[in-house]
């Protein structure tokens, strides 16, 4: 048993039929010695008396908020949550496996630049009685600070018969060094509590591997005289690290016909302009990627040819 | 050329060669994103590599103030990786494919380090840890880890030279 936060405890249980469970001793937080009784949740039925209460915790029916009282006055509470381990593996019932970029990916994170700011998100089908708490650090043995905000519900989607809820959190490395080569990964730890079930999820990454620039901005077309060619120009996204002479992007320019089956013409360039042939009813799209490290491409910025 | 005395390197040449190094490092190990090598244990094998750290002066301000600290750090790393790529880790079994970019990568590392430090001038270099994996699978894993680490290192070096070429060239 360990303390998650004040008055909230997690009991780790090997989860199999007829498992013996864990013996837990609760102590009433009071200088009083006599006349103490214990109850569970909203029930008034006395489970035991004395400064300590010993319980055998085997299943969710044994978890809940234990309260010690004296003479009708509440002295203290202890909320017991369960963390299940089945076949040596901690349960992952609360979050959905996103399966990208690989199986057992419950947390996904992205950064728009090298500032040390990043966003993580996760999915669940659970709509109520759900709380999340996020902690992060750079490295684990001698951790350096990363500050995370509160996790918030960021999207709701309908997937078949189910509703899916997306939660996200923003974190910022306290002393980020954008130009350095990372040697210790960022660790992100999410505590999830659904009713009386506790689970934790972790992710470990370098900022450089989760970089995904915003799409290029101010995408414009300038027709060239007496030609089907156009000059496409764009700018670095506002959110990208500066100076751009140091934090450089490379770009992919694509001409795409109305039909998805039509052949796509693609040009790669380090410049912020390119000359392409603009076909009727086609659109021109541009996306960006770190020039020197192959992390994710941005989403496309697009304009119609007409 | 960067010499210990403090004259400027051939920024544009260094920029071109470092960008080529980035391309080669990724073509040598393109599937890096699909393999979380940090889960594979054996961490001590690659945590001795020289990293370009916060105090090494490789940020835009540090380069403007005095690029020598950063260039020396980059040179150290280039020599380190050049030796690793020429070692038994890459020359032993399983053999690299004949068209593997590792050979080109090795030569380019040497080329860039020579651009930074001509013959007769010596910057301090870092000791190469004695890594001699016994099993072919260990060697393969170590190659991936080294290449992954090299990708991060050359990305920072390429940024330094690109910025130098744009802002510090005479």
């Amino acid at each position: 048993i360990w303390e998650l936060k004040k008055d909230v405890y997690v009991v780790e249980l090997d989860w199999y039929p007829d498992a013996p469970g864990e013996m837990v001793v609760l102590t009433c937080d009071t200088p009083e010695e006599d006349g103490i009784t214990w109850t569970l949740d909203q029930s008034s039925e006395v489970l035991g008396s004395g400064k300590t209460l010993t319980i055998q915790v085997k299943e969710f029916g044994d978890a809940g908020q234990y309260t010690c009282h004296k003479g009708g006055e509440v002295l203290s509470h202890s909320l017991l949550l369960l963390h299940k381990k089945e076949d040596g593996i901690w349960s992952t019932d609360i979050l959905k496996d996103q399966k990208e970029p690989k199986n057992k990916t419950f947390l996904r994170c992205e950064a728009k630049n090298y500032s040390g700011r990043f966003t993580c998100w996760w999915l669940t089908t659970i709509s109520t009685d759900l709380t999340f708490s996020v902690k992060s650090s750079r490295g684990s043995s001698d951790p350096q600070g990363v500050t995370c905000g509160a996790a918030t519900l960021s999207a709701e989607r309908v997937r078949g018969d189910n509703k899916e809820y997306e939660y996200s959190v923003e974190c910022q490395e306290d002393s980020a060094c954008p130009a350095a080569e990372e040697s210790l990964p960022i660790e992100v730890m999410v505590d999830a509590v659904h009713k009386l079930k506790y689970e934790n999820y972790t992710s470990s990454f370098f900022i450089r591997d989760i970089i995904k620039p915003d799409p290029p901005k101010n995408l414009q077309l300038k027709p060239l005289k007496n030609s089907r060619q156009v000059e496409v120009s764009w700018e670095y996204p506002d959110t990208w690290s500066t100076p751009h002479s140091y934090f450089s992007l490379t770009f992919c320019v694509q001409v795409q016909g109305k039909s998805k089956r039509e052949k796509k013409d693609r040009v790669f360039t380090d410049k912020t302009s390119a000359t392409v042939i603009c076909r009727k009813n086609a659109s021109i799209s541009v996306r960006a990627q770190d020039r020197y490290y192959s992390s994710s491409w941005s989403e496309w910025a697009s304009v119609p040819c007409s | 050329r960067a010499v210990p005395g403090g004259s400027s390197p051939a920024w544009t040449q260094c920029q071109q060669l470092s960008q080529k190094l980035c391309t080669l490092a990724w073509s040598a190990h393109p599937l890096v994103g699909h393999m979380d090598l940090r889960e594979e244990g054996d961490e001590e094998t690659t945590n001795d590599v020289p990293h370009i750290q916060c105090g090494d002066g490789c940020d835009p301000q540090g380069l403007r103030d005095n690029s020598q600290f950063c260039l020396q750090r980059i040179h150290q790393g280039l020599i380190f990786y050049e030796k690793l790529l020429g070692s038994d880790i890459f020359t032993g079994e399983p053999s690299l494919l004949p068209d593997s970019p590792v050979g080109q990568l090795h030569a380019s590392l040497l080329g860039l380090s020579q651009l930074l430090q001509p013959e007769g001038h010596h910057w301090e270099t870092q000791q190469i840890p004695s890594l001699s994996p016994s099993q072919p699978w260990q060697r393969l894993l170590l190659r991936f880890k080294i290449l992954r680490s090299l990708q991060a290192f050359v990305a920072v070096a390429a940024r330094v030279f690109a910025h130098g070429a744009a802002t510090l060239s005479p």
Epitope: L40, D41, Q42, S43, S44, E45, V46, L47, G48, I55, Q56, E59, F60, G61, D62, A63, G64, D129, K195, L196 | -
Partner: nanobody
């Protein structure tokens, strides 16, 4: 809908024995403590015995050495074996259980049965 139904109450001679049973039914997620209470005419309701989820019993002084509480978690039942009954044991005996239901599946609330009459004649 959750129901607690007591049975086994009847008229019995002093010194005799009786076994009360209580069955909880309906949408029940889990049961914590189960207990027997009694109320004699013109008196306050008083606790007789409690048994925790883990099977630990606790008795009121009046029930010690004569009464035995037991439960079957699989069947959601609780029993009270009463021996050496006395006229002062005459009362309506109520079953009480702390239940979690689907609507309150992580909070125990108290539920009561309707009671069963036990009369001990001298």
């Amino acid at each position: 809908e959750v129901q607690l139904v007591e049975s086994g109450g009847e008229l019995v001679q002093a010194g005799g024995s009786l076994r009360l049973s209580c069955a909880a039914s309906g949408s029940i997620v889990s049961i914590s403590a189960m207990a027997w209470y009694r109320q004699a005419p013109g008196k306050q309701r008083e606790r007789v015995a409690t048994i925790t989820r883990g099977g630990t019993p606790d008795y009121a002084d009046s029930a010690k050495d004569r009464f035995t509480i037991s439960r079957d978690n699989a069947k959601n039942t609780v029993s009270l074996q009463m021996n050496n009954l006395k006229p002062e044991d005459t009362a309506v005996y109520y079953c009480k259980a702390a239940l979690r239901t689907p609507t309150h599946d992580y909070n125990y609330y108290d539920y009561w049965g309707q009671g069963t009459q036990v009369t001990v004649s001298s």
